[in-house]
Interface confidence: medium
């Protein structure tokens, strides 16, 4: 069957997100991938969206992220925009109202996004073959 257009959009957004570092991509987020053995795909997407929402809600106005130069300001703005888009698309793919995020493990946002990109690419290769 054909790949969902949302999945393509997610991969595109993740490619953009992982292309350049910002002041805040080294900050940590809950690592939902550390122990996701008995988690459904929909739950994983839902929990990833929750983690991203927590991140941008907390750091959108963070002066450390906004930086001290116009370039840093615009880069952070771009990061938040992409995270919001990713959040929206992941919710759409998950189709769940809510999901708990209780893991203690942490990873940097950068690593979290790279891991999510790997998962999404794997899913895409399966549905496009």
């Amino acid at each position: 069957h054909k790949c969902d257009i949302t999945l393509q959009e997610i991969i595109k957004t993740l490619n953009s997100l992982t292309e350049q570092k910002t002041l805040c991509t080294e900050l940590t987020v809950t690592d939902i991938f550390a122990a996701s053995k008995n988690t459904t795909e929909k739950e994983t997407f839902c929990r990833a969206a929750t983690v991203l929402r927590q991140f941008y809600s907390h750091h959108e106005k963070d002066t450390r992220c906004l930086g001290a130069t116009a370039q840093q300001f615009h880069r952070h703005k771009q990061l938040i925009r992409f995270l919001k888009r990713l959040d929206r698309n992941l919710w759409g793919l998950a189709g769940l109202n809510s999901c708990p995020v209780k893991e203690a493990n942490q990873s940097t946002l950068e690593n979290f996004l790279e891991r999510l990109k790997t998962i999404m690419r794997e899913k895409y290769s399966k549905c496009s073959s």
């Epitope: 001290a68 116009a70 938040i80």
Partner: antibody, heavy 117, light 106 residues
Framework: EVQLVQSGAEVKKPGASVKVSCKAS????????MHWVRQAPGQGLEWIGV???????YYADDFKGRVTITRDTSTSTAYLELSSLRSEDTAVYYC???????????WGQGTLVTVSS | DIQMTQSPSSLSASVGDRVTITCKAS??????AAWYQQKPGKAPKLLIY??SHRYTGVPSRFSGSGSGTDFTLTISSLQEDFATYYC?????????FGQGTKVEIK
């Protein structure tokens, strides 16, 4: 209610400096950037510069070296200082709050600065 | 710097008319375009931000569209909207405005 209240009109001689203030209320001052924009009589809007949430500033090339934007977080007031004034600087100067990322969502009432010998 | 070029520079219209103003950026600004309305002697007011998002309290007759380099402000049915309209990009520094479009009564 968000409000930006600017200082009163100024008349200056060429070569002098002017400092315009913009007092903010109704929101957390340091959560938003503050822009300064001017409008010469009968002309369009011209962006001058911005002071970011962090306190860092960025100026349009046309004003670099002549403009200084500062703020006093204790009084939630932003300032625009323009030096070496010339007649072409006669304009209404506006402060405008930067939306978190998009647009300038609240504007001061404007301050008319007249440069005349 | 990114130039924002508006057209037309002025137009005459009647109450109830549909009015379209366009703005062309000299390079892509993605979706980072805003529109303002300014009435004589008053400060500008934000109408549309991020290309198509109506600002709080702005009537639904105002809409924005476009992406990349081409943006449009549409007033579906002109009311007491006779004013000058400005587009602006906040994609990158320096922030820049279009030269304005004056909407006058026919």
């Amino acid at each position: 209610e968000v409000q930006l209240v600017q200082s009163g009109a100024e008349v200056k001689k060429p070569g002098a400096s002017v400092k315009v203030s913009c007092k903010a209320s109704g929101y957390t001052f340091t959560d938003y950037s503050m822009h300064w924009v001017r409008q010469a009589p009968g002309q369009g809007l011209e962006w001058i510069g911005v002071i970011f949430q962090s306190g860092a500033t960025y100026y349009a090339d046309d004003f670099k070296g002549r403009v200084t934007i500062t703020r006093d977080t204790s009084t939630s007031t932003a300032y625009l200082e323009l030096s070496s004034l010339r007649s072409e600087d006669t304009a209404v100067y506006y402060c405008a709050r930067g939306g978190i990322f998009y647009g300038m969502d609240y504007w001061g009432q404007g301050t008319l600065v007249t440069v005349s010998s | 710097d990114i130039q924002m070029t508006q057209s037309p520079s002025s137009l005459s219209a009647s109450v109830g008319d549909r009015v379209t103003i366009t703005c062309k950026a000299s390079q892509s600004v993605i979706n980072d375009a805003a529109w303002y309305q300014q009435k004589p002697g008053k400060a500008p007011k934000l109408l549309i931000y991020y290309t198509s998002h109506r600002y709080t309290g702005v009537p639904s007759r105002f809409s924005g569209s476009g992406s990349g380099t081409d943006f449009t402000l549409t007033i579906s049915s002109l009311q007491e909207d006779f004013a000058t309209y400005y587009c602006q990009q906040d994609y990158t520094s320096p922030w820049t405005f279009g030269q304005g479009t004056k909407v006058e009564i026919k």
